[in-house]
């Protein structure tokens, strides 16, 4: 008789995929034109990524540094109507694709939470969840939580405000810290908060580094859903030397947990890269006109149409990590063990019951090396095979689909392999 | 049971201004979110206003932003609507309607629970 399939685990929707932001609504059209209305006219695009969530904003009207002039509950006429709103919200709806809401109230000024008003921006903050849940919102986000005093407290309160209204609504919490223990403190208090942090870019980017990081990180925080990113508002750019980009997708689509990219990662977007733009908000590159100030200053395979048109694209290797990420038992909820594997190495393994397993390898180093792979630290659930197909690799000149034998496998510098073998009873 | 009784309602010329109120039974009146609404003959319900538990935030309807303000006294139990620079169009029965399951009101009527029985508010040109 064949063996008993293990119980699914519930799933919310943001366990099935990558979460996107979009910070700067003008950044992400460029031509600074950038408005809701225009911003319906990319979901085909977001789709094409196969992002779950649109994490959107903020888009409320702030008179920096004046919490009277502040209203959480009133477009900025800059962006549009609440209309306009509620047209992209249906939109996106029939493309599946949840809006998460940027609720952080003094976007536009030095502190974030109006550092001596934050029991009446609090407030404020509670009757705009509710008038947003109303409207048909999927969630929210608020940053910068280090400046908000009694934080854990008032994400408590969010956070039953939010699940209260539906358990299929999600409260994130960005944070500039990187800071474990301040980390695991502010998640104790609430269950089923998804936290964003730089905890993941402060790190010396070697292999065995990056494990410990990871591992702690998920020791810490016990059996609760995750989400990896490397800051809470930035793009990977500007945190990760370049070689490494590429890696680096290929470990946020893989670790147990949810993916939070920033609008441009998908192409490698600089931040600041081109003259006279604001570093925190860099204009997306949709093709070559773009930047038109400057003619030539962007080149196509700087682009998403350039990259489009090219299967060995970081755009490209994005849609692919995205779509493994969304139908993969393994790595929509599989289990995860790392392994040893040779030194600037970091190897793991996903795998849920009887389902296909995965295996990463990632060389963090700056020269080719055998992966070593040392299947002795793995559970009887979880054994290597011989050989394993190879899904990706960050680098060209491999044939997907091929099969590679694990003890001769050797890496490139700065390669990351994405492989596959079945379930054997 | 809450129950609400809307005044202030009558017949004013165009560019006039009027107070209406609406007066809630029950002592967690603070704890409601309350909205007006409005019905023009022949026409269906139509979102006016909605104002926080504390009064803390407000929404109005696009069109009427500027002209009419919302506030609620939680000591007395009201909820009022201040009209100002009215318009033949204003012409409508104003309901006052409370939330109960959320603090703040919402745009869509099918939130609110509890509603009163309209004021007439008509203004001639």
């Known amino acids: 008789r064949a063996p008993r399939c293990r119980e699914l685990p519930a799933q919310k929707w943001w366990h099935t995929g990558a979460l996107y932001r979009i910070g700067d609504l003008q950044a992400f059209q460029g031509h600074g034109s950038g408005n809701l209305a225009g911003l319906k006219g990319r979901l085909d695009y977001l789709s094409s990524l196969k992002v779950k969530g649109l994490v959107l904003g903020p888009l409320h009207k702030n008179q920096k540094d004046d919490v009277a002039q502040t209203d959480l509950l009133q477009i900025d006429p800059n962006f549009g109507s609440k209309e306009d709103f509620d047209n992209l919200l249906q939109s996106a709806k029939k493309k599946s694709i949840r809006v998460i809401l940027d609720l952080t109230p003094n976007y536009r000024g030095e502190n974030l939470w109006f550092s001596t008003q934050v029991d009446s921006v609090a407030t404020k903050v509670k009757d705009a969840l509710e008038f947003w849940l109303q409207a048909g919102v999927d969630g929210f986000q608020v940053r910068d939580i280090e400046n908000l005093k009694d934080a854990s407290s008032f994400l408590a309160e969010w956070e039953n405000i939010t699940k209260g209204f539906s358990e299929d609504r999600l409260l994130i919490a960005g944070t500039n810290s990187s800071d474990l223990q301040q980390i695991v403190s502010l998640l104790e208090s609430n269950k089923d908060l998804l936290l964003t942090s730089s905890y993941l870019s402060d790190s010396s980017f070697t292999g065995e580094h990056t494990k410990s990081l990871v591992t702690q990180y998920l020791n810490a925080t016990g059996n609760r859903w995750c989400s990896w990113s490397l800051s809470q508002a930035g793009l990977l750019t500007s945190f990760l030397p370049a070689q490494l980009l590429r890696l680096y997708q290929l470990m946020l689509f893989t670790l147990p947990g949810t993916p939070v990219f920033s609008y441009g990662d998908e192409i490698g977007l600089k931040a600041a890269a081109l003259p006279g733009q604001p570093v925190e908000a860099p204009v997306m590159l949709w093709d070559e006109s773009s930047f038109p100030d400057i003619p030539g200053a962007v080149s196509a395979n700087m682009t998403v149409k350039g990259q489009s048109e090219d299967p060995g694209s970081l755009l490209s290797l994005f849609r692919q990590l995205s779509d493994q990420r969304s139908k993969e038992r393994s790595l929509l909820h599989g289990d995860f063990h790392t392994f040893s594997s040779g030194p600037g190495l970091f190897s793991y393994i996903r795998h849920w019951d009887q389902n296909e397993r995965f295996l990463v390898v990632l060389n963090f180093g700056d020269v080719g090396l055998s992966a070593g792979l040392q299947a002795s630290d793995l559970p009887a659930s979880a054994s290597l095979p011989t050989k394993a197909d190879l899904v990706l690799s960050t680098q060209p000149g491999r044939e997907e689909g091929s099969p590679l034998e694990l003890e001769r496998l050797k890496l490139e510098p700065h390669e990351g392999l994405l492989l596959r073998f079945p379930y054997v009873a | 049971q809450v129950q609400l009784v809307e005044s202030g309602g009558g017949l004013v010329q165009a560019g006039g201004s009027l107070r209406l109120s609406c007066a809630a039974s029950?002592?967690?009146?603070?704890?409601?979110?309350m909205g007006w609404f409005r019905q023009a003959p022949g026409k269906e319900r139509e979102f006016v206003a909605t104002?926080?538990?504390?009064?803390?935030?407000?929404y109005y309807a696009d069109s009427l932003k500027g002209r009419f303000t919302i506030s609620r006294d939680n000591a007395k139990n009201t909820v009022y609507l201040q009209m100002n620079s009215l318009k033949p169009e204003d012409t409508a029965v104003y309901f006052c309607?409370?939330?109960?399951?959320?603090?703040?009101?919402?745009?869509?009527?099918?939130?609110?629970?509890?509603w009163g029985q309209g004021t007439q508010v008509t203004v001639s040109s």
């Open positions: 309607a409370a939330d109960t399951r959320h603090c703040m009101g919402y745009t869509k009527d099918g939130g609110y629970a509890y």
């Open positions: 029950g002592r967690t009146f603070s704890r409601y979110g």
């Open positions: 104002i926080s538990c504390s009064g803390t935030s407000t």
